[in-house]
Each structure stands twice: as structure tokens, then as C-alpha cells.
Amino acid sequence: QSPIFGPQDVSSIEGNSVSITCYYPDTSVNRHTRKYWCRQGANGYCATLISSNGYLSKEYSGRASLINFPENSTFVINIAHLTQEDTGSYKCGLGTTNRGLFFDVSLEVSQVPEFPNDTHVYTKDIGRTVTIECRFKEGNAHSKKSLCKKRGEACEVVIDSTEYVDPSYKDRAILFMKGTSRDIFYVNISHLIPSDAGLYVCQAGEGPSADKNNADLQVLEPEPELLYKDLRSSVTFECDLGREVANDAKYLCRKNKETCDVIINTLGKRDPAFEGRILLTPRDDNGRFSVLITGLRKEDAGHYQCGAHSSGLPQEGWPVQAWQLFVNEESTIPNSRSVVKGVTGGSVAIVCPYNPKESSSLKYWCHWEADENGRCPVLVGTQALVQEGYEGRLALFDQPGSGAYTVILNQLTTQDSGFYWCLTDGDSRWRTTIELQVAEATKKPDLEVTPQNATAVIGETFTISCHYPCKFYSQEKYWCKWSNDGCHILPSHDEGARQSSVSCDQSSQIVSMTLNPVKKEDEGWYWCGVKEGQVYGETTAIYVAVEERTRGSPHINPTDANARAKDAPEEEAMESSVREDENKANLDPRLFADEREIQNAGDQAQENRASGNAGSAGGQSGSSK
């Protein structure tokens, strides 16, 4: 007996599609070997029609596909536009030749069934509405009109012109005439369900003079679209349910045996398992919407369905669209930390992977917000200005060619806790989700800057020192000047490096930065940080105010500017969030639900372009001591 398994008989009718699943034993060799679908000839030879090596025969051109799902140990053969010529014996199998492991499948394609004369065939999807047309002669214009459904020899009345409606069609069936038409009546059946399928007879009049029409109604299950995604990548479900449900609440649910559990809907419901990694985006006024899920996990694989109903929940007889999501564990997307922890006043360096083949793509970092459908306003990008409320404490360091960029956020407060997304305007699969957890600090920060009230005087020399502990001895220390388009490394002087690491004196590890002479444009945020090669570590920030030699009052109160790192007053945090909302024009968060529109984000950011690039030292007035 064959270890390959599938349907032994498949029957369909002309014009339809079939989707044949073949199961194979779960071994490494089987997962990677050639899969094929061939047609058995009278001579015993099995002619390949399609294979996983990319072969596609002429007779299957444009109408067939073969997809391998190694994590399920299955492959699926989809064949569309069936004709009676497709009837025959086939094999689905594995191996370099068509004599390997296989399973016999018999496919029978029949003609569209013969119905009584004048039978009209109506084909509709579940949840849709059918309008059955019933013609009659003038003599029956004033007679009773009815529609019945054939059950064996009997025909059970569905609806008639005396206002009778079968209970199972209540609120779904209506009988009507259009305008002044004297020879035709119509029956609408809405919210179609599978059991509505069958042969209907509409009738005008009674007895031998009655006019009868036959209608065959086919109600189709939505054929799930197969989606094949990598672990840790993202998937977008594009849902188009039609204009008739444009004003109803929308949902995406995941099939679980008989139920379908809602993952997200437009009424604010969201499954906690998808917290921080899902967005629902309305597309237009016709009810189109998309749902983006990032950071795909193995357990996300399964059957998904989108639909619409005023309750925001799945309802029998309402239109749906279906997908089957497969999550491939052999992912090209590297495993990165999904949770990053920080402390108040401290900093975090978040590494964002991107497709190394797209090093020139624009990089972004956004903050996922839970309100209703979820949104992700961009906070920083390679060509996007840093959002207000994040000045002086957020920078993106691109490392071309490394397949990753780093986002540094310092002066952390507990309000920074939440979910953040790394994304680019390139390969949409490379969207990663990070949860940032900020706890209250219980000890002094590792990096400390002196003086803390930093006010420099124009024309004079100003030195600022950054104290670091011995654990950072071997790491590269740097100072950089923060600007809206990054933090530009400055020349600095490491006084601790003169000692041997054996006799590291905790109190004298200092890296200092000197401005000589101080200029007005030196005012701003400066960061002291540590890194090892391309790997960024701890940072701390200080605001340097610059004042005229003759003036007594500084340009900005440095105590206030630097206080943010210590206690982040509530007033300022609230102010920031208001300002952030006012600044939406910068980059629309909804753009990140789909590739076509993410491009617009890049174009828009282009307008905000500033000179310089993170990591360059050009144009700064810092000098070595």
C-alpha cells in the first residue's frame, strides 16, 4: 500500500475548479524532493502535467498550480476551467521519476447537468443574494405567483403572492414585480446558505394553464486562497465583500473546528494573542479593508475568514472570504528579540532586520497603538523627521550591507512601554514587532554626564564628560550630536583607555567631548554612548544650552531640558501626545498596511529630507582635546 494519500475520486462539472491535496510521510527527503501530478495513459506511461520543479504542460498552461507545504507534509494541485477532456486517471506522487511513491486519483468531469427545459442555472457564493426570474403569460397576470423548492418528488412552497413565506426563508425571501412588467415576476433570496442549493420551480396560475419555470441554484463555499508565509514575516489579508455590506462592521476570524474566533473587528474587539502585531485598515467606501499581521508565529497557521455583520461577529448567511495560511519554519528572516527591557532614565538599542538585498530601502520605526483597529504612527525614519516628543532621544542608525538597522531610544519613561514595529518601504515580509517594557530604575544609570546643567558660552571652550563603568572598558565610546535626521558621531577623547584593563579604576573612566570655540549652532542634544562595531549599546543624553558671553540668562533652561531623563513630568508627556497628533501629516500610519501605499510614505518623507546621515561626523564643531 502506498504511503501517499489523497482523494481517490474527485468529481466536478465543466467550468469548475478542483483542489486536490496529497499527503506524504513527514521526512526530510520527502519534504524537499520533486512533487508531481501526471496523467495515466493506456500504455502504462504517466505523462507529467505539472511538477514542483516548475514544469507545466501545455494543456495546463494558465489554469493549474502545484504548491508544496512541507510543514504540513502535503502538496496541493489546483486545476481550473475543467472540461470533460480532463476526465481520467491521475497520480500525485513524489520522486525524480513518475515511478516513485504515488497515489491514484480518478477525476470525473461531467457536463453541466441536464435540467428540465427552461432551467436557468444560478451560481452564487454563500451570503450573497440571488434574484430568480419567473416568466408567465398574460392570462396568468392576476393569478397567484409562487416559488417552491423540489425535495424528491414534492415541491415545498418557499414564498407566494399571498404573503406566505416558509419559516426557513423568513426575512430572506421577497416576491416582487418590477415597474409595469406584466409577464415577469422575481424572487430575491438573500443571505444564502449551503442548504438553499437545489432545484426551484416558479409558477404563475393553477392547474394545466399554469406557467412554470425551473431554476437550479448552486451555493458555493468560498474556496480558500492559499497563503504561504515565512516564520516571523507578515501577511496581509485583502478583503473585498462587496458594496452591500459596506456599512456593516467588518471582522477577521480564525476557524477553530465549528466556530470562527474573531481576531479583530471594526467594533474594537481584538484577540490578545495578536496584541501589538495587527492592523485593520479600511481601503475605500465600498467595504474593502485589509488586515495586516506581523511577526508570524507557527501557531498562526490555519484557516482565516473575513466577513461583515452589524455585530462584528461571524453570522451564517453573510458574505465571507477565506484563506488558508501556512507558516514556513525555514524562514529567511532572522530571529530577533521580541521583548526588549529598559529602565526609566535609561536607553534601549533595538536591532531591526531588513532584507539585505534592499540596503537602499527607506527604514522606519513606528509605535503600534491599540485604539480600535490599531494604527502605527511613524516616529523616525531614514528620511523622515523625528516626531515631536521624541526630539533628542530617538535616532535611527542605518548600517548598509549588514541587513539590519538600529533604533536607539533614551531618556526612557514608563509611557514608552508598548509595541513598536520595524519596517521598510521594500520587502513587506520583513516587518518585525518588538515589545518594549520599561520598569522603574532601581540604581544609578551606567552612563553619567557632567556637568548636568550644561550651559556653554559662545567663543569659549566647553568640555563635557561622560563617566562609564569598567564593564564598558573594552567597548568603543562615542559622543554624537543629535539632529532630526540622526545622531552624528563627533571626535571625542577617552581618558580611561590609557589604563590597563586589569587595574580599571571605576571612578576615572571618562570619555569627554570639547566644543572649541563654542558656536550658536552647537546648542542642542548630545549623546554619550558605547558600541562594539555595529552593535550599539547604552546611551545617555544631555541638552547643551549656548548663551552669549554678555548675557546672563541662558537660551533654554538646561535643568528643564535634562530633567526629562529623570522624571518626565506628566504635563510634558501629555503635551507630546497632543503634538504628535497634530503632526500626522508627516507620515500617515495607515500607509503601512500595504505595499502599494508604503511607497507614498517614502515619497512624502522625501519632502522632509535633511542633509547628513546617521553616523557621519561632517559639519560638526566638536574637536579632540
Epitope: 475520486d9 462539472i13 469548475n16 478542483v18 486536490i20 446558505i193 451555493v219 473546528k257 465549528e258 484557516h303
Partner: nanobody
Framework: QVQLVESGGGLVQAGGSLRLSCAAS????????MGWFRQAPGKEREFVAA??????????YSADSVKGRFTISRDNAKNTVYLQMNSLKPEDTAAYYC???????????????????WGQGTLVTVSS
């Protein structure tokens, strides 16, 4: 969930035939994948046959041990699935269970875990 009631079991001589029926309640019966399983005393539940109809195409599956002898069919108008058993052998003796898997059919039709509604079973005894 749909309610399932099997009938048609009984005592039959080897080489004889039986037709099992499984009547289902529920308006969406036609969209369910339906399966027959059997369990002989002291043995594990074993897949026999399954049928799935998606509104346009029908897919029939059967175990190697019954291929060519047993045929599964369904009548959506009557909410019933049948198992026609010919050339019965003593080793076919078992309790036969009807099972339903809601759409979309999840995973392997041979796996009992993919079915969420089960009948009480009907006993088939094949004497030699």
C-alpha cells in the same frame, strides 16, 4: 454542532453487503466533510472513508483496506451520508461511527481529531 444518527448495521455473512446511513441535523450539512470510522473491540478507531463537497466538486477518500469494496456517498437534500459495503470480510466486524468536520475541512480527513461531531455508532458483524 450537527447531530448524527447512524443506522443500517447488523449481522451479515462474509461476502455479503450492507448499507449504512447517517442522518444529520442542521441547515449547513452540505458544507461539512463527512467521514466513517470504525472501531473493533480492543483496537484503535480507524478511518474508513470520507466525502467532502464544496458546492461544486465532490472529493471521496477511502482507506486502502476497503478500497474497491466500500463506497461513500451523500444526499444533501436528505442531509444523509451513506456507506455502501460490499464483499464484506470477518475483519470488517466493528462499531461504525459517522463523523462531521465543519468547513473548511481542517487537515487530514483520516485524523479523528479533525472531526467535532460524532454519532453513537452502529454495530456491523460479519460472520464467516
Amino acid at each position: 454542532q450537527v447531530q448524527l444518527v447512524e443506522s443500517g448495521g447488523g449481522l451479515v455473512q462474509a461476502g455479503g453487503s450492507l448499507r449504512l446511513s447517517c442522518a444529520a441535523s442542521g441547515r449547513t450539512f452540505s458544507s461539512y466533510a463527512m467521514g466513517w470510522f470504525r472501531q473493533a473491540p480492543g483496537k484503535e478507531r480507524e478511518f474508513v472513508a470520507a466525502i467532502h463537497w464544496n458546492g461544486a466538486s465532490t472529493y471521496r477518500y477511502s482507506a486502502d483496506s476497503v478500497k474497491g469494496r466500500f463506497t461513500i456517498s451523500r444526499d444533501n437534500a436528505k442531509n444523509t451520508v451513506y456507506l455502501q459495503m460490499n464483499s464484506l470480510k470477518p475483519e470488517d466486524t466493528a462499531a461504525y461511527y459517522c463523523a462531521a468536520s465543519p468547513p473548511p475541512t481542517v487537515g487530514d480527513v483520516r485524523d479523528p481529531a479533525n472531526y467535532d461531531s460524532w454519532g453513537q455508532g452502529t454495530l456491523v458483524t460479519v460472520s464467516s
